[in-house]
Structures are given as C-alpha cells and as structure tokens.
C-alpha cells in the first residue's frame, strides 16, 4: 500500500516552491490541464542565457514524513534535446538533480539552509529515457520521463525535496512523495495493523479478531516487507471463542445463531442444539436444557438434554419368613440416558397409619441403592410387620429434578412369628413298648404356646406310613404301642397363635428289652 | 513585432449580439492560452473568459457564463468571442490578452497576462 | 471565489517609496501579479509570481507576498510611474482571474 505524502496532481492550490538564486531564466509554475482535464501544476526552466556553472533551484514546501523511514519520490518529467534548441550552449545539459534536506520544522527560508550539497542529501543524478524535440514552428513532441527515487533513511519530522537544474530545458510534470506501508491485514482470524516498515523487513505482533481467543504462544506475527507487501507465510493462533464461528473467509468470528451452539475454542462450525435444548440468543455456547430436561455436570455440553426416568413398573414380592425379594420391569420412560439405577426405600408402617424407616438390622442385596438389576433380596424382617417398600428408577440427572423421584410402592406383612424348634428332649421313662418323653418350653415371640405336636418312627422305618404323630397340651407326652428294645427318632414342635414352629432335632430314643427294667428312667 | 489587436467593437442595442476579434501576431498562436478582459468606464479590470491553446477547455466569468462564447482558429491565428444578449452593463472596453507561455508545451501556460492587445470599445446603449 | 481588496489611491512624492497594498484570505498562498495601467492605454505586466520582475520593468518596482497581503514597492517613484495598478490571482479552480479593484498611483508636485 502506498501512502502520499504529496501529489502535485492533486493539488488544486498553487504550489509556490521556492526557487534560488531570484534572477532570470529561473524555474516558473505553470498550469495546465491533464488528460482528464483537471488543473494540474508543473515546473519549467530554460534558462540558456545563464553563465556556466549556475544553478536554479526548485524547493517543495516542507513534507511530514508521517512515519515513514524510507520516501519514494515518483517525477514525471520531459527533457528538451540539447540539439534542438536554437540557442542551446555548450553548457546545455539533459540532466537535473535531485536533493533532500531534513528539518523537524518548517525552517527553511529563501537562503536557508544553504543551496549546495551538505546540508543537501543528494539523492541521485537523473537523466532522462526519452528526449523532446523541437523544429521550429512545430510543437515539441517527446514522450513523458518517469522516474522515482528513494529517500532515506529519514529520521527528522519531515523533510524538502529541492531539484537543481545546471541547464538543462525541462518540465517537471508532477512529483508523487509517497511512502509504503503492509496496509491493516486480517487473515486465519488475526488482525494486523497498519504498518510502516523501518527496516528490511519487520515483525508485527497480531491480535486476534473480536471473539477469537488466542490458542497459542507467543502471539501470532507476521513480517512486514520494505515493499508494503506482507511475508507470505502461515499465520495460525487464534480461534473463534465458544457460541462463535469462522466466517467470511477465516476473516471474522460470527455468533452462532439462535437454535444453534458451539461449545469450545475452535475452529469448528457452530452446531444444532442437541434434543430437548434450545438457544434462544445468538453466541451461545450451550443449549439450555427445556423445562424438566437436564444435563449431568459429566455430560458434555454437546450432549442431549435428558430427564429422570419414570416409575419401575410391576413389582413382586417373594416372601420367605424373614427374606423378602422383590423384582420389578424396568421404567417405560428412561429419560434418554443409559446410567439407569434403582433404589429401594423402606418403611414400617403402624396399625394407625403413622411410618418410620425401616430398622437397621435390615440388610439389603446387594444393596438399597445403585442397584443396576431390576431385583434386591431383603433380609431380616420382623415377623408380623406391615412394610412399605419403594422402588425409584434413577439417572445421572433425577439429583437435578425438583421433587422426590416416582416409585412403585408395595405393601408387605410378615408372618407372626411361630415357636422356635423344640430341643432338649429327655426320656424321662421307657418300657418295652412305650417312651415317656419332657422337653423344655419354648419362648414363643407372640403368645403363649398352645399345644405340642410329637412326630416319631422307628428308625429304620423311613417311609411316611411308619411316621405317626401325637398332639399333647404339655411339655410331656407318653408314645405307646412301641416295639420291644427298639430304637424310635422323634422330633417335637409347638405351635402358637401364629401356627407351627419348626421340628427340632431328631431326638433317639430305644425301648426296654424286658419287664423288670420298665419304666427305668433314662436321659436322652 | 509580438502583438495583439482587437476588432468589432462597435454600438449595439440591448438584447443584441456582436463578435470580437484579436488578431496575433509575432508569436507561436497556437501555443498560447488566451483570455478576454473588460474594463468599464472608469472601472477596474474584469476577466471575462479563457480559452486553452488547442480549445480542449473554455472558462468563464459567471456574470458572461452562458451569453459569451469564447473560441479561437489557430490556422488564422485570431481569437473570437461571441457576445449574446448583451445589456448595458457589459459596455466596456474589451481587451484580449496572453497568458504567459510555456517554451514548449502549449498544454501548459503561465497564470499572468504578459501580451495586451491595444483594446476595442463595445457600447449597449439603445 | 477569493476577493481582493486594494485601496482606491496612493499619493508618492517623487523619489519617494510608494506601497500599494492588495489582501485577500490567504493572499500568500496564491501567487499575485501586478499590472500597471495608464490612462488610454492597454495594461502591462510589472510584477508576476509575486516577485519576480519581466525584462524592460526598471528595477524599482518590487513585489512581495505573505500572510493575507501582497505588495507592490515602487522605490524612487518617478512622474512616469503614475498610473492605475491593478494586482491580480488566480482563484483555486486554477482556471478563473481574479483582479482587485485598483490603485490609483499620484506622484505630487
């Protein structure tokens, strides 16, 4: 890019450059019009009545270098031929020369600084490509010169150009001072300013664009040539912030727009919101999950929206004296997840109506909660007890939900419970054909006992014709009708309110051979 | 000799027309720029209009603009100018003049009068 | 359009120095040209570019220009220099003439 500092074509004013020594045959403004008819100023000498060695100078008004290290100066210019001038000398020359000098004000008057080289820079000695001639009578044809020179390096404020003719016949046509700059660049979604090279070539620091974050260190650079031009060469370090995307060629970051989202640093496009989430603004980096959905604090923000499952359905109860196992179908609803888990809350509920959880001799399999098969066994329950069991399905998102979970609830009550087994039988007599047979009284849980039942057979004799049994009040009872010096198995059980108990062990007992020993007493 | 002379002054009845010619000679015409100027009785100097050596471009006073036409024949080396619709202001003595020339570019031209012609007198009267 | 204002006359006595004045906004910025004029003749070029002086105008006439003022110096004045001056610009469109109104020059005795 090039930035003027002074275009002579552009200028609608006169020019009034300062011309030294003040005599005849000095430089002159004239103006005149361009190929698009515009007023345009140019500079004329021809001076061949000058003695040798003289020069004219032509000075610009002072130029502020804005910056700029290093000037270009384009001159467009037509030289007349020595040849063709009438009353050309041998001192005509088809040459000029151009200075500079710097300042950092506009000091310079019509003596100051001195006319000559030092404190002028000479910038270079220009000849020019192509000559007009002129025959007399006709007009002067010739084509334009075009040349342009550098300045630098400059370090003051701003500066003059002068132009020294030594007699030369010449129009200066326009004088362009411009500069070069690596005009402001947005490439890969980084920023870099305006930029005027001082040397060779310069780094310039980017920045990321508005909502792009930088991804990398340092920050992006890229290199500014002396030409303007910027060093060709792969910029990356940024990327578009979340809830915005690359557009327009990686030149901005557009907001995602409403329904849409993108959750990271990135240069991925923005995205639809996932199921059951919605963006209602633009540059959303998430979709917000809709009334009653969720996400897990583990779910990513790309994931679906999902709600706690419903209620387990079709629960059933096995109970086994104090083992209860319950086994239910999974929820209808899962909610959109796979973490599914259930969880079995007990309560003991009173004839009055009033519940309190279950008591902690209860144990649970696997376990009361995180149960990932649709069953748990349940141990220790009392008898006689009404228990209210609920199975809730859960998710990773029911802890968000506002509310108790659903459940499927099911009422259970246990037996009363019976007598224990009665142990500890004694044959407190035996005869040759009938036992008399005491036990210890059980402590039955829910009432008193009420009666006794005797099951006994001879051994030996296992199938269930030989098996006979006797009902007594007490803790006694005589078996008679036994087989001489044979050997019975008995067992006893009690029964209360709430029914049987168990048989005890099986107690061996042996009747007596002859008379003489009945009724001896014996201990079990 | 380099010099300018005008002709076709004369008086003329509001609303009519009259044209004015300058002769030059001594000097490249068609090199030149050229202009008309006017002078009222015991006034000042009023530039009317200008013409560039090769009537690529005209310009005009606003007070002529649209009345006035400026021209010129190179190959007689003589500039006109064509009056309309005069009124009794424009009585004044008429003078063609040169613009300073460039010594070799007539698309060029210096921004004084350096050649006067000697004047010619136009009367609106009716 | 710019508009330049000189004052209608000027008395000199011979020998002396006459100025006569021609402003305008800016007056420096533009170059001015000043024409002599004298009673039934054509108008002459006596100064252009402000300062610089055509070949046959004697070496007392002078110009300069700075500021919101140009000026015409006639050092020594003589009985011939009496006449009208007239100084004269170009306006910015570089195409229209612009002449200010006129200094009447009178050299006493």
């Known amino acids: 890019l090039e930035e003027t500092l002074l275009n002579t074509k552009l200028e609608t004013a006169d020019l009034k450059w300062v011309t030294y020594p003040q005599a005849e045959g000095q430089w002159e403004e004239l103006s005149g019009l361009d190929e698009e008819q515009h007023s345009v100023r140019t500079y004329e000498v021809c001076d061949m009545k000058r003695p040798g060695g003289q020069a004219h100078w032509l000075r610009t008004g002072w130029v502020p270098r804005r910056g700029a290290v290093h000037v270009y100066a384009t001159i467009r210019f037509t030289m007349m031929e020595c040849l063709s001038l009438p009353r050309a000398s041998r001192s005509c020359k088809e040459t000029f020369t151009v200075f500079y000098y710097e300042s950092e004000a506009d000091t310079a008057t019509a003596h100051t600084p001195a006319w000559m080289e030092n404190p002028y820079i000479k910038v270079d000695t220009v000849a020019a490509e192509h000559l007009t001639r002129k025959r007399p009578g006709a007009e002067a044809t010739g084509k334009v010169n075009i040349k342009t020179l550098r300045l630098g390096p400059l370090s003051k404020a701003g500066f003059y150009l002068a132009f020294q003719d030594q007699g030369a016949c010449m129009a200066l046509l326009s004088l362009h001072l411009f500069y070069k700059k690596c005009s402001w660049l947005i490439t890969n979604l980084t920023y870099f300013p305006e930029t005027v090279p001082r040397e060779l070539v310069v780094p310039v620091a980017g920045s990321c664009v508005a909502n792009a974050v930088p991804t990398a260190n340092p920050s992006p650079s890229l290199y500014c040539r002396e030409d303007g031009q910027w060093a060709e060469q792969q910029v990356t370090g940024c990327s578009c912030a979340p809830g915005y995307e690359a557009a327009e060629s990686n030149k901005v970051c557009r907001a995602c727009g409403q329904g849409t989202f993108k959750p990271q640093i990135g240069d991925e496009s923005c995205l639809p919101c996932p199921a059951n989430s919605h963006s209602n603004n633009i540059g959303s980096p998430v979709c917000l999950c809709r009334i009653g959905y969720y996400r897990a604090r583990s779910d990513p923000r790309s994931s679906p929206c999902t709600t706690p499952p419903s209620a387990p359905r079709s629960v059933v109860h096995h109970l086994n004296g104090s083992t209860l196992r319950l086994e239910w179908s999974a929820p209808l609803e899962s909610g959109g997840r796979e973490d599914l888990t259930y969880a079995v809350r007990c309560r003991e509920c009173r004839p009055g109506g009033s519940c309190l959880p279950c008591g902690g001799d209860m144990t649970f399999d696997p376990g009361p909660r995180d149960l990932v098969e649709p069953w748990v066994a349940i141990r220790g329950l009392r008898p006689d007890v009404t228990y209210t069991f609920e199975v809730a399905a859960l998710n990773g998102v029911s802890t968000l939900a506002t509310g108790p979970p659903p459940f499927e609830p099911v009422n259970v009550t246990t037996d009363r419970e019976v007598p224990p087994a009665v142990s500890d039988i004694r044959v407190t007599r035996s005869s040759p054909s009938s036992l008399i047979l005491s036990w210890a009284i059980p402590r039955a849980p829910s009432g008193a006992v009420l009666d006794y039942e005797v099951k006994y057979h001879e051994k030996g004799a296992e199938g269930p014709s030989s098996v006979r049994f006797l009902k007594t009040s007490e803790n006694r009872a005589e078996l008679r009708g036994l087989k001489r010096g044979a050997s019975y198995l008995v067992q006893v059980r009690a029964r209360s309110e709430a029914g049987y108990g168990p048989f005890g062990q099986e107690h061996h007992s042996q009747t007596q051979l002859d008379e003489s020993e009945s009724w001896r007493e014996q201990l079990a | 000799q380099v010099q300018l002379v005008e002709s076709g002054g004369g008086l003329v009845q509001p609303g009519g027309s009259l044209r004015l010619s300058c002769a030059a000679s001594?000097?490249?015409?068609?090199?030149?720029?050229m202009s008309w100027v006017r002078q009222a009785p015991g006034k000042g100097l009023e530039w009317v209009s200008n013409?560039?050596?090769?009537?690529?471009?005209?310009h005009y006073a606003d007070s002529v603009k649209g009345r006035f036409t400026i021209s010129r024949d190179n190959s007689k080396n003589t500039l006109y100018l064509q009056m309309n619709s005069l009124r009794a202001e424009d009585t004044a003595v008429y003078y063609c003049?040169?613009?300073?020339?460039?010594?070799?570019?007539?698309?060029?031209?210096?921004?004084?009068?350096?050649?006067w012609g000697q004047g010619t007198l136009v009367t609106v009267s009716s | 359009d710019i508009e330049l204002t000189q004052p209608p006359s000027v008395s000199v006595a011979p020998g002396q120095t006459a100025r006569i004045s021609c402003s305008g906004d800016?007056?420096?910025?533009?170059?001015v040209h000043w024409y002599q004029q004298k009673p039934g003749q054509a108008p002459v070029l006596v100064i252009y570019?402000?300062?610089k002086r055509p070949s046959g105008i004697p070496e007392r006439f002078s110009g300069s220009n700075s500021g919101n003022t140009a000026t015409l110096t006639i050092s020594g004045t003589q009985a011939e220099d009496e006449a009208d001056y007239y100084c004269?610009?170009?306006?910015?469109?570089?195409?229209?003439?612009?002449f200010g109104g006129g200094t009447k020059l009178t050299v006493l005795g």
């Open positions: 800016n007056l420096g910025k533009k170059y």
């Open positions: 013409i560039t050596s090769s009537s690529s471009m005209t």
């Open positions: 003049a040169r613009k300073g020339m460039s010594f070799y570019n007539n698309k060029y031209a210096k921004s004084m009068f350096d050649l």
């Open positions: 001594g000097f490249t015409f068609n090199n030149s720029w």
């Open positions: 004269s610009a170009w306006t910015t469109t570089m195409m229209h003439i612009v």
């Open positions: 570019y402000d300062s």
